[in-house]
C-alpha cells in the first residue's frame, strides 16, 4: 500500500548492527509523486566502494547511490547527512553487513517523503503537444483556441472532421487554407452522392502544398482518397503529384488529411462533381445493341438482340433478345445473359428408324434420319437430312420440322419361294418366303399382314371368334415354336358389311364378300420373318387374267395330315370361274346349285393337284406386282372350295381396296395419321 512518508532504520539501531545481515525495504508512494529519501544518521564500516558493509539505494534498474562510513550534516540547521530525490514513485533500499566488524558501528537512520514532480519539465519527453500544466500529484494538457484535446488527453488537433458533402458539385479545402494547416490533426471529409453517380475529383497542381515525404519516401503529412475498396494516394509534397482528374467509380468518397507535429504548409484545395456512372460498352458476341452509343451511363437501357441462330437462355426458356440497364454500380443488369448458339437438343427418335448421335446439336448442325432397311422406308420423302435452324427446331428442306415416317416395305420376301417338291400337292416353305403369313389358331386358319396395325383375312375365319389369337414370324406352328414367335393381340375385328352372317355357318353356300380386317392393339415390328404384303392397285394393271400365277401358303390340311406343322406353299394359276363351278362339292351341305359364285371371287388351281384346303382360309393369294416385279400383292384370300386338290375360290381383294382403305383410315390411331 503506497504511503506518503516513512522511516527506515538499520537492524538494532541505535545499537550496533549485527554481522552477516541483508535487509531490504521497498518504498512506494502514490502515482504522480516522486520520493525524497534522506539520511539523518550514517555509521557504517568504511571500505573501498563500500564493499564490506553498505546501504544501497535502487530506483528501477538504476543504482541511485551506495553509502558507508560516517557522515555528519554540513548544515547546522539541518540533520540531513545524505539525501536522494527521484521522480519515480518506487524505490528500494538494501542494507548489507559482512561477517566481521572491527569496531562497533551503529548503522543508519533514514526517512522518505512523497514529493511532487513536474511532469512538464522533469522529463526529456514532453507529455503534451501544446500546453502542459503541472499540479501536485499530476499534470494536464491544454490546447490553443480552435484546437481540441484528443482522447489521449495529450495531443491537440483541429476539429476538421465530420463534414458530409451530398451536393452533386462542391469544393473542399484543408483547414485555414491557404494559411498553414494545423499540426497533429486528422481531417476526414465524406462525399456521399446519390447511387448511380460517381465522384470525380479535380485538383490543380498549384493548389496543393503539403509537407514533403521523408528520405524513405513516407509522407509525413498526407492526403488520401478512399472509394470503397479502392484507394488513391497517399499524396504529399509541393504541387499535386497525382492525376488531376480522379474518377472514383463510386458514389461515396472519404478524404483523409493527416498531419504531424512539424512542418506546416498552406495545404490543399479541390473541386468535385458527380458524373452519372458509366457502364462499359461490352463486347457481347453474336448480338446487336440498340440504341448504339459511344458511351452509356447510369439509367441507360439497351436491347440486346441475338443474331439468327443464337438465343439467350435463362433457366429453361429461350429468347432472342433481352434488355440491360446501366446500374448504379456501373455494371449492366442481366450481364450474365449471353447469346449462345441455338441448341436444337437431342433429335427426337422415330419409330422404326434411327438418327445417328449428332456431334453437335447447335445451330447449323446437320443430322440424318434413316429407316431400318430393308424392312422400312421413308414414306414422306425429304431424304432424312435435317439441320438445326435458328428457331431451335430440326428442319428438313421438304418436310420442315415434321419428322420423317418410316413405314414397312410391303411385298418383298427376304428369301424367294422355290418349289422343292411336289397346302395340297404343295411344297415345304419357310416363313421368310411368306413373311406376311399370319397364323390363326382358333379356328385353325391364315391371314395376311398388310401393315403394322392391320391383318387381312377371310370373314368366315373371324365370324365365330371376334378375338382371334394370331402369330407371325414362325415357320412351324408347334406350340413350342409359337411360344417363341410374335403373338398379335386384336383390338377389333371388322367384317365386310356384305358378308351374310348365318345362324349355322356350317351350312354356308354363299361366300360372297368373304373378307375381314383385324385391327391390332400394338404395331408389329417388321423384320426378315415378319413384313406385310402389298394391296393391289386400283388400275387395270391389277386385273387378273386366266393363267396368271399366284402363291398360296398356310398350315392347312395336306395329303398326309389334317394340319401341317410347317408352312406349306404352292404356285397355282388363275382359272376361269366356271372351272370352279364344274367341280363336284366333296361333302355338300346343300344342293350343288345353291353354291354362289360372284365376280368378287377368283378361281385358281387345278394344276398337279395343287390347292388350298381346310385350315388355309384367310391366307393371301400372292401375285407379282405388274409394276414392280420385286414385290407381291394380295390378289386374293383363301375363301372356300368344292374339293381339296382341285380348284379353290379366293376373295378378289382388288374389289375391296376402297373398303380396306376407308376402314383403316377411320380406325387409325393418331400415331398413324
Amino acid at each position: 500500500e503506497p504511503t506518503m512518508y516513512g522511516e527506515i532504520l538499520s537492524p538494532n539501531y541505535p545499537q550496533a548492527y549485527p554481522s552477516e545481515v541483508e535487509k531490504s525495504w521497498d518504498i512506494e508512494v502514490p502515482e504522480g509523486y516522486g520520493i525524497h529519501l534522506y539520511f539523518t544518521h550514517l555509521d557504517i564500516e568504511l571500505s573501498e566502494n563500500c564493499a564490506y558493509d553498505s546501504v544501497q539505494i535502487i530506483s528501477g534498474d538504476t543504482e541511485e547511490g551506495r553509502l558507508c562510513g560516517q557522515r555528519s550534516s554540513n548544515n547546522p540547521h539541518s540533520p540531513i547527512v545524505e539525501e536522494f530525490q527521484v521522480p519515480y514513485n518506487k524505490l528500494q533500499v538494501i542494507f548489507k553487513s559482512d561477517f566481521s566488524n572491527e569496531e562497533r558501528f551503529t548503522g543508519f537512520a533514514a526517512y522518505y517523503v512523497a514529493t511532487d514532480i513536474n511532469e512538464c519539465t522533469d522529463f526529456v519527453d514532453v507529455p503534451c503537444s501544446h500546453f502542459c500544466n503541472n499540479f501536485i500529484g499530476g499534470y494536464f494538457c491544454s490546447c490553443p483556441p480552435e484546437y481540441f484535446l484528443h482522447d489521449d488527453m495529450k495531443n491537440c488537433g483541429v476539429n476538421c472532421s465530420g463534414d458530409v458533402f451530398t451536393a452533386l458539385i462542391g469544393e473542399i479545402a484543408s483547414p485555414n487554407y491557404p494559411k498553414p494547416y494545423p499540426e497533429n490533426s486528422r481531417c476526414e471529409y465524406q462525399i456521399r452522392l446519390e447511387k448511380g453517380f460517381q465522384v470525380v475529383v479535380t485538383l490543380r497542381r498549384e493548389d496543393f502544398d503539403v509537407e514533403a515525404a521523408d528520405s524513405a519516401g513516407n509522407c509525413l503529412d498526407s492526403l488520401v482518397f478512399v472509394a470503397g475498396d479502392r484507394q488513391f494516394g497517399p499524396y504529399c509534397g509541393h504541387g499535386f503529384p497525382g492525376p488531376l482528374n480522379i474518377e472514383t467509380k463510386s458514389n461515396a468518397l472519404d478524404i483523409i488529411f493527416q498531419t504531424d507535429l512539424t512542418g506546416q504548409k498552406k495545404g490543399w484545395k479541390l473541386r468535385y462533381h458527380g458524373d452519372p456512372m458509366p457502364c462499359p460498352k461490352e463486347d457481347t458476341p453474336n448480338s446487336v445493341w440498340e440504341p448504339a452509343k459511344a458511351k452509356y451511363v447510369f439509367r441507360d437501357v439497351v436491347q440486346i438482340t441475338c443474331l439468327d441462330g443464337f438465343e439467350v437462355v435463362e433457366g429453361r426458356v429461350g429468347a432472342t433478345s433481352f434488355y440491360s440497364t446501366c446500374q448504379s454500380n456501373g455494371k449492366w443488369s442481366n450481364s450474365k445473359l449471353k447469346c449462345q448458339p441455338v441448341d436444337c437438343g437431342i433429335p427426337e427418335s422415330i419409330e422404326n428408324g434411327k438418327v445417328e448421335d449428332p456431334e453437335s446439336t447447335l445451330f447449323g448442325s446437320v443430322i440424318r434420319y434413316t429407316c431400318e432397311e430393308p424392312y422400312y422406308y421413308m414414306e414422306n420423302g425429304g431424304g432424312g437430312e435435317y439441320h438445326c435452324a435458328g428457331n431451335g427446331s430440326w428442319v428438313n428442306e421438304v418436310l420442315g420440322p415434321e419428322l420423317p415416317k418410316c413405314v414397312p416395305v410391303c411385298g418383298v420376301p427376304r428369301e424367294p419361294f422355290e418349289e422343292k417338291q411336289r397346302i395340297i400337292g404343295g411344297s415345304d416353305a419357310d416363313i421368310k418366303n411368306f413373311p406376311w403369313q399370319v397364323f390363326f389358331d382358333n379356328p385353325w386358319a391364315g391371314g395376311a399382314l398388310i401393315n403394322e396395325y392391320w391383318v387381312l383375312t377371310a370373314a368366315h375365319v373371324v365370324e365365330g371368334n371376334r378375338e382371334p389369337t394370331m402369330y407371325v414370324g414362325s415357320t412351324s406352328v408347334q406350340t413350342s415354336r409359337l411360344a417363341k414367335s410374335k403373338m398379335l393381340t386384336p383390338e377389333h375385328v371388322f367384317i365386310h358389311p356384305g358378308w351374310k352372317l348365318l345362324e349355322v355357318p356350317e351350312g354356308r353356300t354363299n361366300f360372297d364378300n368373304d373378307i375381314a380386317l383385324v385391327r391390332l392393339k400394338d404395331p408389329v415390328k417388321m423384320g426378315p420373318t415378319v413384313s406385310p404384303i402389298c394391296l393391289p392397285g386400283t388400275s387395270s394393271d391389277y386385273n387378273l387374267m386366266d393363267g396368271d400365277l399366284g402363291l398360296i401358303s398356310g398350315w392347312g390340311r395336306t395329303e398326309k395330315r389334317d394340319r401341317a406343322v410347317r408352312l406349306k406353299a404352292a404356285r397355282l394359276p388363275v382359272a376361269p370361274l366356271r372351272k370352279c363351278k364344274e367341280v363336284k362339292v366333296e361333302k355338300p351341305t346343300a344342293d350343288a346349285e345353291a353354291y354362289v359364285f360372284t365376280p368378287n371371287m377368283i378361281c385358281a388351281g387345278g394344276e398337279k393337284g395343287m390347292d388350298s384346303c381346310k385350315g388355309d382360309s384367310g391366307g393371301a393369294f400372292a401375285v407379282q406386282d405388274p409394276n414392280d416385279k420385286t414385290k407381291f400383292y394380295a390378289a386374293g384370300l383363301v375363301s372356300w372350295g368344292p374339293q381339296c386338290g382341285t380348284y379353290g375360290l379366293y376373295t378378289r381383294v382388288k374389289n375391296y381396296v376402297d373398303w380396306i382403305m376407308k376402314t383403316m383410315q377411320e380406325n387409325s390411331t393418331p400415331r398413324e395419321d
Epitope: 397364323f439 382358333n442 406352328v477 408347334q478 406350340t479 413350342s480 409359337l482 411360344a483 389334317d562 394340319r563
Partner: antibody, heavy 125, light 107 residues
C-alpha cells in the same frame, strides 16, 4: 431316325423308389410334349403322366398322383419319371411316348405318335 | 374322368374280312381320339389320330370315324399282319384314358 429309349427299370421292394429315364434322338426334343404309359403283365395300356414341351405343364393318372413326378431336361434330350412309395400294382412295362402339340393359345394335341420299347418295373417283397 | 368302353374285347376274323371295332366315351370328346395297334412283345403304334386322320405310313385299309361319344375303327380287308390288339385313346381331357382293348385273332 426318330428314337426313344427307356432305362432305369428294375426290381424294387414295396415303398421303394425308382427313377426312369427316356433318351430321345432324331427329332427336336424341346418341340414336343412327352408321356409315360404303362402296361401291367397281360393287361391293357394305362396312361401314367404327361408333360408339355417346356416342362411348365404336367398331368397324372389318379393312381399315381402324389407318388410319381414327371420331369424333363431339354438340354439333355431326356424325360424322367421319379417313382416313390412303389406298390405291387405299379409292376408293369413302362413306355415313353412322344406327343405333338400344335397351335398357340388354343392348341391341338396329337398324342403318342412315337413310342419307345419300354422298361420293366417289378415291385415285389 | 372319362371312361372309354371298347367292344368287342376280342374277335376272330379271316384274312380279307372287314373288321369294325367300336369305342364309346362316357362323355362327349369331340374328335379327340386315337387308335393304336399293339402286337405281342412290341410297343403300341398309332394308326389314326383326331378320330379319322390316318397316320402317315399306315395302310389305307385302316380308317376311323365318329365324333362326340361313338367312334369306329374299320379294317376294310384284314391282312395277316393286322392280327393284334387294338386300343382307343381319348385325349379330350386329363387324365388320358385308353379303352380296354380289342384282340383280333385268326379264325
Amino acid at each position: 431316325q426318330v428314337q426313344l429309349v427307356e432305362s432305369g427299370g428294375g426290381v424294387v421292394r414295396p415303398g421303394g423308389s425308382l427313377r426312369l429315364s427316356c433318351a430321345a434322338s432324331g427329332f427336336t426334343f424341346d418341340d414336343y410334349g412327352m408321356s409315360w404309359v404303362r402296361q401291367a403283365p397281360g393287361k391293357g395300356l394305362e396312361w401314367v403322366s404327361g408333360i408339355n414341351w417346356e416342362g411348365g405343364s404336367t398331368g397324372y393318372a389318379d393312381s399315381v398322383k402324389g407318388r410319381f413326378t414327371i420331369s424333363r431336361d431339354n438340354a439333355k434330350n431326356s424325360l424322367y419319371l421319379q417313382m416313390n412309395s412303389l406298390r405291387a400294382e405299379d409292376t408293369a412295362l413302362y413306355y415313353c411316348a412322344r406327343d405333338e402339340q400344335l397351335g398357340g393359345k388354343y392348341y391341338y394335341y396329337y398324342y403318342m405318335d412315337v413310342w419307345g420299347k419300354g422298361t420293366t418295373v417289378t415291385v415285389s417283397s | 374322368d372319362i371312361q372309354m368302353t371298347q367292344s368287342p374285347s376280342s374277335l376272330s376274323a379271316s384274312v380279307g374280312d372287314r373288321v369294325t371295332i367300336t369305342c364309346r366315351a362316357s362323355q362327349g370328346i369331340r374328335n379327340d381320339l386315337g387308335w393304336y395297334q399293339q402286337k405281342p412283345g412290341k410297343a403300341p403304334k398309332r394308326l389314326i389320330y383326331t378320330a379319322s386322320n390316318l397316320q402317315s405310313g399306315v395302310p389305307s385299309r385302316f380308317s376311323g370315324s365318329g365324333s362326340g361319344t361313338e367312334f369306329t375303327l374299320t379294317i376294310s380287308s384284314l391282312q395277316p399282319e393286322d392280327f393284334a390288339t387294338y386300343y382307343c385313346l381319348q385325349y379330350r381331357s386329363h387324365p388320358l384314358t385308353f379303352g380296354g382293348g380289342t384282340k383280333v385273332e385268326i379264325k
